[in-house]
């Protein structure tokens, strides 16, 4: 619409303009959402990228607390593996966050298609093998450039895996490279934090990474609006439920 001014003086409206915004288009969008019976949408994408063998899939299974017996020997991911990670948020609002996790294959033959699936409304984990030293940090740069090109303001967390088999020299070299070349540097995306973990077992390091992922998800804003909990029409949620239930009926080899 072309409306640029929407005076609301003398109208006793119970609005919190801090969350809506004061521009006419923001107010109209909010009123439209109200009309459409809007509900909070506590779902967000978590994209896991990195080179082959860096431990992305194993890391994801540990983060999601998948049972050890379900892990077995890890075969290479084909294309992109998508799954839901439900998280209970223990705050005042007692809400459930669902991270829709996209585990990108690290093999080179998939590189050309991956960028098409990288979106703005997502949190990115860029994973590398810490035990291979600082060359691995360099090898992660093409992924970071792709994120910058497709989702420049999306938060990124760098994750160095194989902490259990890396020594002080390797850790020090990776830290130095990350600090000097990646953090707050032009040409790179918004790297919010970085962690070192052993992805094969539950640990203090893994718990801290999990906490960072949750915090970054809940605090991520696009145009000053929180992504998680954003109001969307109820019919969209219903449509999503129908599509998800239909997906269960699709044969696995499809």
């Amino acid at each position: 619409s072309k409306i640029w001014d929407l005076p609301l003086d003398e109208l006793h409206l119970n609005f919190d303009f801090k969350h809506i915004g004061c521009k006419a288009k923001d107010i109209i969008r909010f009123l439209q959402q109200r009309l459409k019976k809007a509900v909070p949408y506590n779902r967000m994408k978590l994209m896991i990228v990195g080179n082959t063998g860096s431990g992305k899939t194993t890391l994801l299974q540990q983060l999601m607390k998948t049972k050890k017996s379900d892990l077995g020997m890890q075969s290479a991911t084909v294309g992109i593996d998508v799954k839901d990670w439900p998280i209970q948020i223990r705050d005042k609002r007692k809400r459930d966050l669902v991270l829709n996790v996209w585990d990108f294959a690290g093999r080179e033959e998939f590189y050309s298609t991956h960028p098409h699936f990288m979106t703005q409304r997502a949190l990115y984990l860029a994973v590398y093998d810490l035990s291979k030293g600082q060359a691995e940090v360099d090898a992660m740069k093409p992924w970071l450039f792709n994120i910058k090109a497709r989702a420049s303001s999306s938060p990124v967390i760098l994750v160095g895996t194989h902490l259990d088999v890396s020594d002080e020299k390797q850790r020090k070299a990776c830290m130095s490279k990350i600090t000097k070349e990646l953090l707050n540097k032009r040409g790179f995306p918004a790297i919010r934090d970085y962690h070192f973990v052993n992805a094969t077992e539950e640990s203090d390091a893994l718990a801290k990474l999990r906490k960072t992922i949750i915090n970054e998800s809940l605090n991520f804003k696009i145009r000053d609006q929180l992504v998680v909990g954003q109001l969307i029409p109820d019919c969209y949620v219903e449509l999503e439920k129908i599509i998800l239930s239909e997906r269960k009926n699709v044969p696995i080899e499809f």
Epitope: D164, R171, K172, M175, T179, D193, N198, S203, K208
Partner: nanobody, 121 residues
């Protein structure tokens, strides 16, 4: 090689306060922690802070009394100790790990020489 130098120790009365400082050489912001060792006792963990200064860990006995913080521009980590008790008497050591967070899974890589804190009753 990272070098850690502690300062700020001394003699204080019970209920008093002290602020310990740990100055680090080098330009990488490591996770830093404080330990203490009382006479004839094991060295024990006190508090730790991550590279950015927004994630902290404390041992139960100091929670609510001690605060760890850092100033990355000065490459210094602080331990503010309030409501001191005689049982806080010990040599306080600063330690660093070549990691962004204080992960209990890995041992510290660097240690300072220590600073004596004595709390009299």
């Amino acid at each position: 090689q990272v070098q850690l130098v502690e300062s700020g120790g001394g003699l204080v009365q019970a209920g008093g306060s002290l602020r310990l400082s740990c100055a680090a050489s080098g330009d990488v912001n490591y996770a830093v922690g404080w330990f203490r060792q009382a006479p004839r006792k094991e060295r024990e963990f006190v508090a730790a802070i991550n590279w950015r200064g927004d994630n902290t860990d404390y041992t139960d006995s100091v929670k609510g009394r001690f605060t760890i913080s850092r100033d990355n521009a000065k490459n210094t980590v602080y331990l503010q100790m309030n409501s001191l008790k005689p049982e806080d008497t010990a040599v306080y050591y600063c330690a660093a790990k070549s990691a962004p967070y204080w992960y209990s899974d890995i041992a510290p890589d660097y240690w300072g020489q220590g600073t004596q804190v004595t709390v009299s009753s």
